[in-house]
């Protein structure tokens, strides 16, 4: 991967990732330097007859660093702070080849919840105000609300009117997704509106 266009690599929080390294064909490699955000990460001297010398120069990531037989970088137990720019410099007798990567750490979505702030009008129409959330949502999470295959909202919030006299039972489903996972949570309009109706009659008495 040339230094002009970094290879963008997705990693999942807590899991492992490999940054693949391609060797110049037929050339003897003198040494390989791996950098993270322009700071030295590891220095590797390959040997033809014995194991390579690997000098890990970044103690923070050191214990989680590994290298494949082709000196690709493996990083385990990924943390959010591993996000950033990685570079590998392969030095041969005649040249230096640079490979660049951008590592992006994504969270597996967890713990989807729906909160409900609904109200009942005197004509018995129920207005649902639903809000969907997931743990540690960031800008890469897409939310949408669906019913019967139609998208009713492209945001965490859904406002919709439901009239039990003319509407059949209806489920509303929140779908949260990012590049590595998706979650969904369904709620019943009938159930939510019945709960509101009970509260409404309780306060009237």
């Amino acid at each position: 991967q040339s230094s002009l266009t970094p290879l963008m690599v997705n990693g999942i929080l807590g899991e492992s990732v490999t940054l693949p390294l391609e060797f110049p064909a037929g050339e003897k490699v003198n040494f390989i330097t791996w950098l993270f955000n322009e700071t030295s990460l590891a220095f590797i001297v390959p040997h033809e007859t014995k194991s390579p010398e690997i000098h890990v120069t970044n103690p923070k990531q050191g214990k989680r660093l590994n290298f494949t037989q082709s000196y690709s970088l493996q990083l385990s137990n990924l943390k959010m702070e591993d996000t950033g720019s990685y570079r590998a410099q392969i030095s041969t007798k005649t040249s230096a080849k640079l490979s660049s990567y951008t590592l992006r750490i994504l969270r597996q979505l967890r713990n989807i919840q729906v909160t409900n702030h609904s109200q009942l009008f005197q004509n018995m129409t129920c207005e649902l105000h639903l809000t969907c959330s997931v743990e540690d949502a960031d800008d890469n999470v897409s939310f949408r609300w669906e019913a019967l295959g139609n998208t009713l909202s492209s945001q965490p919030n859904l406002t919709v009117s439901w009239d039990p006299r003319i509407s059949s039972e209806q489920d509303y489903t929140c779908i949260a997704e990012n590049a590595v996972s998706n979650l969904s949570f369904s709620v019943s309009a009938q159930k939510l509106c019945e709960d509101v109706k009970i509260q409404y009659t309780d306060t009237k008495m």
């Epitope: 909202s153 492209s154 919030n157 590049a179």
Partner: antibody
Framework: QIQLVQSGSELKKPGASVKVSCKAS????????MNWVRQAPGQGLEWMGW????????RYADDFKGRFVFSLDKSVSTAYLQISSLKAEDTAVYYC???????????WGQGTTVTVSS | QIVLSQSPATLSLSPGERATMSCRAS?????MHWYQQKPGQAPRPWIY???NLASGVPARFSGSGSGTDYTLTISSLEPEDFAVYYC?????????FGGGTKVEIK
């Protein structure tokens, strides 16, 4: 039917400000995010960011942080794009586009041409 | 940000021919959307979530792909298909568009 109608073309001098409107009709405005997309003359499409039409919270792409402001008037189902300290390179067609989910822009405004020239 | 590279930049074909255009992402994405734009007009939604045709799009259009490589194919070009086609990813912010492929009459 569902549509987004944008305000008319604007000719402005460098340093001035402009406010582009995007009026939505035919759907529940607060249920769908509104995106803004820029297209410079003869160029491709550039996503500027979006605004959550329920909460009013804007999100800007890095290149559009600072001089660009997204806002709403929910009472008239309208989204706005304001650009301050206009530069010649802001000359472009600006589109509003509804997000149908997964940032798929299913309805687009007709575009507003902003020309910045001294 | 995820960079989308569309190729070729221009496709010069005759009506009735098959058109295939590519969109390559700098990182794996979950799905790709496609838009059609004609001169002086706003973009129109064309294909969403990789392979689903937008309302009113003829069946001669199809979309496919996964990971970093996505394709839009027109099985037999009609005069109204000559336009610019843009791909767009949603997996990562900022939502980025490709540079476009112009399908022009040969």
């Amino acid at each position: 039917q569902i549509q987004l109608v944008q305000s008319g073309s604007e000719l402005k001098k460098p340093g001035a400000s402009v406010k582009v409107s995007c009026k939505a009709s035919g759907y529940t405005f607060t249920n769908y995010g509104m995106n803004w997309v820029r297209q410079a003359p003869g160029q491709g499409l550039e996503w500027m960011g979006w605004i959550n039409t329920y909460s009013g919270e804007p999100r800007y792409a890095d290149d559009f942080k600072g001089r660009f402001v997204f806002s709403l008037d929910k009472s008239v189902s309208t989204a706005y794009l304001q650009i301050s300290s206009l530069k010649a390179e802001d000359t472009a067609v600006y589109y509003c586009a509804r997000d149908y989910g997964r940032w798929y822009f299913d309805v687009w405004g007709q575009g507003t041409t902003v020309t910045v020239s001294s | 940000q995820i960079v989308l590279s569309q190729s070729p930049a221009t496709l010069s074909l005759s009506p009735g021919e098959r058109a295939t255009m590519s969109c390559r992402a700098s990182s794996s994405v979950s799905h790709m959307h496609w838009y059609q734009q004609k001169p002086g007009q706003a973009p129109r939604p064309w294909i969403y979530a990789t392979s689903n045709l937008a309302s009113g799009v003829p069946a001669r259009f199809s979309g496919s792909g996964s990971g970093t490589d996505y394709t839009l194919t027109i099985s037999s070009l009609e005069p109204e298909d000559f336009a610019v086609y843009y791909c767009q990813q949603w997996s990562s912010t900022p939502r980025t568009f490709g540079g476009g492929t112009k399908v022009e009459i040969k």
